[in-house]
């Protein structure tokens, strides 16, 4: 048994940092391999994490962290019984992939304005908490070409757009997704997409 | 909400040891830090050494090294910290403090327990 | 040993002012600092860790800043039950060592 694509992790900068690999044939990941993480610090307890299959040779493996900082670096140890099969290392602030942004809500009720609001993934006492900026997907069903990006660079969770940017009496989805530029992240996957139908009332046209 | 209570006030004599206990209320005492504190008015704090309950591990300050000794009941969630050969240079309140386990920060302290050595 | 200073030993503010304490280090600690509350019964708490990560049930007032060698903590808007000593904690080197603390006091 042997690895055939080594572990590379990311965090979501406050819980859980998901670690995957790729081992040289079939493996059933829970029973077979356990990743063990410890903190690279005075007086850290080593931690063993059960990994999940991700497709026929993938594993997968979700590292419970009380609490993340930057100077904070773990080892990684990946063993097969008795046999270890990987040793390395992992620097959570290096390697953060954000929460996805929640309850994407799109708000018509405002005159010919659409009002786009979604929560923050992080409490605010997590260090992301202010520093996370968004960008918003939002496309039609019926034209695939019709998919635009919206890119939020301003704390608030919320974006307005006039409704007439868009077609009307069709219907559109939205998502949101989420980066910090602070700590150079990836981007977070993206919310659950939210629909409504945009309609609003054509200008009148002078002669 | 995380607590820990200290044994009582000790009046020992020169020479003579002392051992004080610290309680934690916690679920898993085995995924903290008991660490141990001494306070003077004239050395203000000053850090004894710490003890992961869960493997018996310690770290202590070299200073504190032949005078403290550091122990843990797993069971009944209770750090112990044994004073030996006790002068007046030890009299002063020492307290427990609390940190996750790999942590530099004392997250819950207990409430102190005085020792007077005196004659 | 790294020592921490604590230049104000006591400081003199009144209910609603800004008042900053600072500490220094003898060398870089890496933002391992560490502030801490001690009311005039004994009563010892963790205000801010690692710089400043506010440590749970912390009232918001409360904020911690700086690097390398220098921090500070910051209240923003003095509260009658702020009134205590505050010491300073540098976790990067072993031993571990805390500033000689500032007694806050209200005018």
């Known amino acids: 048994m042997k690895v055939l694509q080594e572990p590379t992790c990311v965090s979501d900068y406050m819980s859980i940092s998901t670690c995957e690999w790729k081992m040289n044939g079939p493996t059933n990941c829970s029973t077979e391999l356990r990743l063990l993480y410890q903190l690279v610090f005075l007086l850290s307890e080593a931690h063993t994490c059960i990994p999940e299959n991700n497709g026929g040779a993938g594993c997968v493996c979700h590292l419970l962290m009380d609490d993340v900082v930057s100077a904070d670096n773990y080892t990684l140890d990946l063993w097969a019984g008795q046999q270890l099969l990987w040793k390395g290392s992992f620097k959570p602030s290096e390697h953060v992939k954000p929460r996805a942004p929640g309850n994407l809500t799109v708000h018509t009720n405002v005159s010919d304005t659409l009002l786009l609001t979604w929560s923050n993934p992080y409490p605010p006492d997590n260090y992301l908490y202010n520093h996370l900026t968004y960008a918003v997907n939002i496309w039609s069903e019926n034209d695939p070409a019709d998919f635009r990006i919206y890119n939020v660079t301003y704390l608030e969770p919320s974006l307005r757009i006039a409704a007439s940017t868009l077609k009307s009496g069709i219907s559109y989805r939205a998502r949101v997704r989420a980066w910090a530029q602070c700590y150079n992240t990836t981007w977070s996957e993206w919310s659950p997409s939210t629909k409504w139908h945009n309609s609003y009332r054509e200008p009148f046209e002078q002669h | 909400q995380v607590q820990l209570k200290q044994s009582g006030a000790e009046l020992v004599k020169p020479g003579a040891s002392v051992k004080m206990s610290c309680k934690a209320s916690v679920n898993t005492f085995t995924g903290y830090n008991m660490h141990w504190v001494k306070q003077t008015p004239g050395q203000g704090l000053e850090w004894i050494g710490g003890l992961h309950p869960g493997n018996g591990d310690t770290s202590y300050n070299q200073k504190f090294k032949g005078k403290a000794t550091l122990t843990a009941d797993k069971s009944s969630n209770t750090a112990y910290m044994q004073l030996s050969s006790l002068t007046s240079e030890d009299s002063a309140v020492y307290y427990c403090a609390l940190t996750t386990a790999g942590r530099a920060w004392f997250a819950y302290w207990g409430q102190g327990t005085l020792v007077t050595v005196s004659a | 040993d790294i020592q921490m200073t604590q230049s104000t030993s006591s400081l003199s503010a009144s209910l609603g002012d800004r008042v900053t304490i600072s500490c220094r280090a003898s060398?870089?600690?890496?933002?391992?600092l560490n502030w801490y509350q001690q009311k005039p019964d004994g009563t010892v708490k963790l205000l801010i860790y690692y710089t400043s990560r506010l440590h749970s049930g912390v009232p918001s007032r409360f904020s911690g800043s700086g690097s390398g060698t220098d921090y500070s903590l910051t209240i923003s808007n003095l509260e009658q039950e702020d009134i205590a000593t505050y010491f300073c904690q540098q976790g990067n080197t072993l031993p571990w060592t805390f500033g000689g603390g500032t007694k806050l006091e209200i005018k």
């Open positions: 060398q870089d600690i890496s933002n391992y």
